[in-house]
């Protein structure tokens, strides 16, 4: 994974800190895996990156993703709040200048090369879930989460809060 382009060095220099005019609260370099401990990997194919969900061989190195955290007002129209609550949003970048994007029309998760400011499709509300898991909700499409479908990442509509704990939208973040 990313073997073609070589191992990326993650420094602040690679990810400047003004996205949509807001600086990240903090950044975190982590590997991303599913609830069932399959790894999320990224591979360069035909000059574009593909995202896979796969079991790694025993000593195979996990790909890393840079999570940039942002503080955001909770839009009252998303929850019926009418209150300025706060939530945490993230962008996810596995290599310089590439970010995970929600393609709501295709219900897919894609890696796009883009310039800053990043589009809203690159932002995800981070949910702190049970069992040391997180989930990623599309900023552009509330109720739609990054999930696993057929060994790929896809966008999955969660129709009720009872389904928020569905295993296929739960992910683990690890520094190793």
């Amino acid at each position: 994974a990313f073997g073609i382009s070589g191992v990326q060095k993650y420094t602040r220099a690679l990810h400047d800190s003004s996205i949509t005019g807001i600086s990240p609260i903090t950044e975190y370099l982590a590997s991303l895996s599913t609830y069932n401990d399959q790894s999320i990997t990224f591979a360069l194919e035909d000059e574009s990156y593909e995202i896979y969900v796969e079991d790694l061989k025993k000593d195979e190195k996990k790909d890393k993703v840079l999570l940039s955290y942002y503080e955001s007002q909770h839009p009252s129209n998303e929850s019926g709040d009418g209150v300025d609550g706060k939530m945490l949003m993230v962008t996810l970048s596995p290599t310089k200048d590439f970010w995970l994007h929600a393609n709501n029309k295709e219900h897919s998760v894609e890696l796009h090369k883009c310039e800053k400011p990043l589009p809203d499709q690159a932002f995800f509300v981070l949910h702190n879930m049970h069992s040391n898991c997180v989930s990623f909700e599309c900023k552009t499409d509330p109720g739609v989460f990054i999930g696993v479908k057929d060994n790929h990442l896809a966008l999955i509509k969660v129709d009720s809060s009872e389904n928020l704990c569905t295993e296929n939208i739960l992910f683990k973040l690890s520094e190793t």
Partner: antibody
Framework: EVQLVESGGGLVQPGGSLRLSCAAS????????MSWVRQAPGKGLEWVAT????????DYVDAVKGRFTISRDNSKNTLYLQMNSLRAEDTAVYYC????????????WGQGTLVTVSS | EIVLTQSPATLSLSPGERATLSCRAS??????????LNWFQQKPGQPPRLLIF???NRGSGVPARFSGSGSGTDFTLTISSLEPEDFAVYFC?????????FGQGTKVEIK
């Protein structure tokens, strides 16, 4: 306006039971994790229990495990705390709290309801 | 469980002065690269109010004179210039893991 209003507190004898309610309004109740936090008179704050928005997960502080049950009725926008086998040390103001969207911290608090356990 | 120790227990200051409150955790409260340490203000007869979340981020409607800092196990709440309404009890709280725990509180009183 977001509001949490607790009720059900009162005086109860040791070993007795009480059910607290928290009526929520002004937000989509089922989208948020809810908790109970208590404060003994003149003392600090103690987290008691949490329930996820979809009722799937519950967690309790050790001191109340097996005696207290947190539940919610999303159709009624109401959070509950069933308290059994009450002890003197359970005497406190009980606050209903709502997590922020995403469940990272206690963002909204009710005014609290006083539970007194005494013979 | 994670034990939070606040100091000092009481801080006696005058309006306009700077207040510095400390909270030390028995182990790191970092998770997913975030410091999951929050600060609350409580006035007599009132519920707590969120001031700071994730160590350094102000809650909604919290004045800019309140700021939080720190990481790992050591955290600070600073009130740059005390207003009369700031005299209250302040609690830190960790949301890294269950049981969620609070510090014992620091009372900021008028000197």
């Amino acid at each position: 306006e977001v509001q949490l209003v607790e009720s059900g507190g009162g005086l109860v004898q040791p070993g007795g039971s009480l059910r607290l309610s928290c009526a929520a309004s002004g937000f989509t109740f089922s989208s948020f994790s809810m908790s109970w936090v208590r404060q003994a008179p003149g003392k600090g704050l103690e987290w008691v229990a949490t329930i996820s928005g979809g009722k799937t997960f519950t967690d309790y502080v050790d001191a109340v495990k097996g005696r207290f049950t947190i539940s919610r009725d999303n159709s009624k926008n109401t959070l509950y705390l069933q308290m059994n086998s009450l002890r003197a040390e359970d005497t406190a103001v009980y606050y209903c709290t709502r997590a922020n969207y995403g469940n990272w911290f206690f963002e909204v608090w009710g005014q609290g309801t006083l539970v007194t356990v005494s013979s | 469980e994670i034990v939070l120790t606040q100091s000092p227990a009481t801080l006696s200051l005058s309006p306009g002065e700077r207040a510095t409150l400390s909270c030390r955790a028995s182990e790191s409260v970092a998770k997913y690269g975030l410091s999951l340490l929050n600060w609350f203000q409580q006035k007599p007869g009132q519920p707590p109010r969120l001031l700071i979340f994730a160590a350094s981020n102000r809650g909604s409607g919290v004045p800019a004179r309140f700021s939080g800092s720190g990481s790992g196990t050591d955290f600070t709440l600073t009130i740059s210039s005390l207003e009369p309404e700031d005299f209250a009890v302040y609690f830190c709280q960790q949301s890294k893991e269950v049981p969620f725990t609070f510090g014992q509180g620091t009372k900021v009183e008028i000197k």
